[in-house]
């Protein structure tokens, strides 16, 4: 039943070109190249893509033509290694070109940069964008793919094609509208926010595969798909998990053509077999390919079958528990996870994986005991504290969020996390804490039954951002420990961290707290980031500062910015009042 078993093709590049079509082929090759060589100019990438495309066409015409039998990694790697400025631009990444496949591709993958030194994307005026769109639509859309791909080197490539399709639709519609800006800007904001979320979710999938292995990813997929498709049989879920794992392994490994092709096949299979998978797929399956795949990935959970029997009969009372565990460990644990997950759409995936791990640990111990059944009879009782911990945490934090609102809730988290891991860079602490704080508006509005899967699985995505950014420049053993010990226990590990008593406070630097009139022209979001950056720096200077002290300083700071932005001579106000504020803050915090 494997969806992906295909006949061997004489020419892999011809096969993928024919399967995907020229437009998707070119777009995916551009994404692949931009994700590997993140600093290369757009024009250079377009040139490389055109050369690869022309070559692919010769192979479509004659699969026996020279070099057409080479693997895609060989063809693409050879092409990337023709870039003249490789050594100057990328330094040691150029050494990858001395290696043979598959080591060369692995080398390129290792040099992907999650935080590339690229300028922030500034959105031009609407009229400027519309003119560029009308002048050369193809180049305009390629530029979008290029700019997103190079900034997000693990973006899920077939999903980026879907974003590009929506991007094009937004410009097609809005550039003809009476009020172009009113039409276009909300759509672009939505695409930007969804794109960041999509990138972060995919980054977690790739981290799961690359750092914790295929088994970890498959466990995650069994749990999530069982929640989503609770009426599907275990065999069906297992088959979908195997195929989904292949798709994500390919995309995370840079095999974007294979990934997109296999994702399309998987969507086709799911739609052809909806009756045995889920009743919620009908609408998705009526859509065109890119929309269909996206829709399936986001589809709501199906209703749980009525009268599911107690799990105890199969996994505690059964005579065959240890036999199954000994002879078919992963299948048996997979069945446990499937049965538990389909009954608990109200649990986060990471909680379900913790329960499965606890069950596994118990069987590991008990199946070697004198009386196994007596030993594991109470295993389900061990689940209670594991379930209650995230429930209580979410309850407390949602109460805090409702009391404070998003901005102040983010600030509370900024203080909390800076005290836990003060060695982490300020931009990373601000970015991660802001995202952690968004859990409030994202999840607290949900009823109890949907809060945990929303909140804890979202936090897993955000904490993975912290982990990948920290891995690039490791500064904290505590972060390394929480990030590497257990994928499913990352959030509890960070939650359990107390104030780092070993931290030596940062030297006070007045320059850090010097502000200028340019803050007045910033958007509300940018202004918040400036204030939150200052807050992190304050905590790094004075980690033992109380909430009340920090609140007083931040309130004074907000009043200072508001006052000076209203002043006639803003710059003078910032200079003079700024000095006073710094002195008052130092006094208030005892610096």
């Amino acid at each position: 039943r494997g969806v992906f078993r295909r006949d061997a093709h004489k020419s892999e590049v011809a096969h993928r070109f024919k399967d995907l079509g020229e437009e998707n082929f070119k777009a995916l090759v551009l994404i692949a190249f931009a994700q590997y060589l993140q600093q290369c100019p757009f024009e250079d990438h377009v040139k490389l893509v055109n050369e690869v495309t022309e070559f692919a066409k010769t192979c479509v015409a004659d699969e026996s033509a020279e070099n057409c039998d080479k693997s895609l990694h060989t063809l693409f790697g050879d092409k990337l290694c023709t870039v003249a400025t490789l050594r100057e631009t990328y330094g040691e990444m150029a050494d990858c070109c001395a290696k043979q496949e598959p080591e060369r591709n692995e080398c390129f993958l290792q040099h992907k940069d999650d935080n590339p030194n690229l300028p922030r994307l500034v959105r031009p005026e609407v009229d400027v964008m519309c003119t560029a769109f009308h002048d050369n639509e193809e180049t305009f859309l390629k530029k979008y793919l290029y700019e997103i791909a190079r900034r997000h080197p693990y973006f899920y490539a077939p999903e980026l094609l879907f974003f590009a399709k929506r991007y094009k639709a937004a410009f097609t519609e809005c550039c003809q509208a009476a009020d172009k800006a009113a039409c276009l800007l909300p759509k672009l904001d939505e695409l930007r926010d969804e794109g960041k979320a999509s990138s972060a979710k995919q980054r977690l999938k790739c981290a799961s595969l690359q750092k914790f292995g295929e088994r970890a990813f498959k466990a995650w997929a069994v749990a999530r798909l069982s929640q989503r498709f609770p009426k599907a049989e275990f065999a069906e879920v297992s088959k979908l998990v195997t195929d989904l794992t292949k798709v994500h392994t390919e995309c995370c490994h840079g095999d974007l053509l294979e990934c997109a092709d296999d994702r399309a096949d998987l969507a086709k299979y799911i739609c052809e077999n909806q009756d045995s998978i889920s009743s919620k797929l009908k609408e998705c399956c009526e859509k065109p390919l890119l929309e269909k795949s996206h829709c399936i990935a986001e589809v709501e959970n199906d209703e749980m079958p009525a009268d599911l029997p107690s799990l105890a009969a199969d996994f505690v009372e059964s005579k065959d528990v240890c036999k199954n565990y000994a002879e078919a460990k992963d299948v048996f644990l997979g069945m446990f996870l499937y049965e538990y997950a389909r009954r608990h759409p109200d649990y986060s995936v990471v909680l379900l994986l913790r329960l499965a791990k606890t069950y596994e640990t118990t069987l590991e111990k008990c199946c070697a005991a004198a009386d196994p059944h007596e030993c594991y009879a109470k295993v389900f009782d061990e689940f209670k504290p594991l379930v209650e911990e995230p429930q209580n945490l979410i309850k407390q934090n949602c109460e805090l969020f409702e009391q404070l609102g998003e901005y102040k809730f983010q600030n509370a988290l900024l203080v909390r996390y800076t005290k836990k891991v003060p060695q982490v860079s300020t931009p990373t602490l601000v970015e991660v804490s802001r995202n952690l704080g968004k859990v409030g508006s994202k999840c607290c509005k949900h009823p109890e039954a949907k809060r945990m899967p929303c909140a804890e699985d979202y936090l897993s995505v955000v904490l993975n951002q912290l982990c990948v950014l920290h891995e690039k420049t490791p500064v904290s053993d505590r972060v390394t420990k929480c990030c590497t010990e257990s994928l499913v226990n990352r959030r509890p590990c960070f939650s359990a961290l107390e104030v780092d008593e070993t931290y030596v406070p940062k030297e006070f630097n007045a320059e850090t707290f010097t502000f200028h009139a340019d803050i007045c022209t910033l958007s509300e979001k940018e202004r918040q980031i400036k204030k939150q950056t200052a807050l992190v720096e304050l905590v790094k200077h004075k980690p033992k500062a109380t909430k009340e002290q920090l609140k007083a300083v931040m309130d004074d700071f907000a009043a200072f910015v508001e006052k000076c932005c209203k002043a006639d001579d803003k710059e003078t106000c910032f200079a003079e009042e700024g000095k006073k504020l710094v002195a008052a803050s130092q006094a208030a915090l005892g610096l």
Partner: nanobody, 126 residues
């Protein structure tokens, strides 16, 4: 929908042998565990033997271990129960049953099985 049809039952002397067959349609036995249950007059159905689907594991009632052997032929979509050294207490109606989509037997509780054959009578005379 899964259809199960048993055959191979009959009357046999103690110490003799029989081979029961369970032919499945609408479901491949290669991916689903299949169980044999038996029910003697006036008694409850009891799990007798089982075989994993896509996982090579066999399961037996303690009293039949060493005498009965369960096997399957994926090409014929059929599961067999080879019964040797039969005893009068093996007399019962033998049923084939499945819980769809499960590669393992995780419970011997008859109430948890969704699909059943019509049964085949086995009588062992002394």
């Amino acid at each position: 929908e899964v259809q199960l049809v048993e055959s191979g039952g009959g009357l046999v002397q103690a110490g003799g042998s029989l081979r029961l067959s369970c032919a499945a349609s609408g479901r491949t036995v290669s991916s689903t565990a299949v169980a044999w249950f038996r029910q003697a007059p006036g008694k409850e159905r009891e799990f007798t033997a089982g075989i994993g689907g896509s996982v090579d594991i066999t399961y037996y009632l303690d009293s039949v271990k060493g005498r009965f052997t369960i096997s399957k032929d994926n090409t014929k979509n059929t599961v067999y129960l080879q019964m040797n050294s039969l005893k009068p207490e093996d007399t019962a109606v033998y049923y084939c049953a499945v819980r769809p989509g499960r590669p393992l037997i995780t419970s011997r509780d008859a109430n948890l099985y969704d699909y059943w054959g019509q049964g085949t009578q086995v009588t062992v005379s002394s």
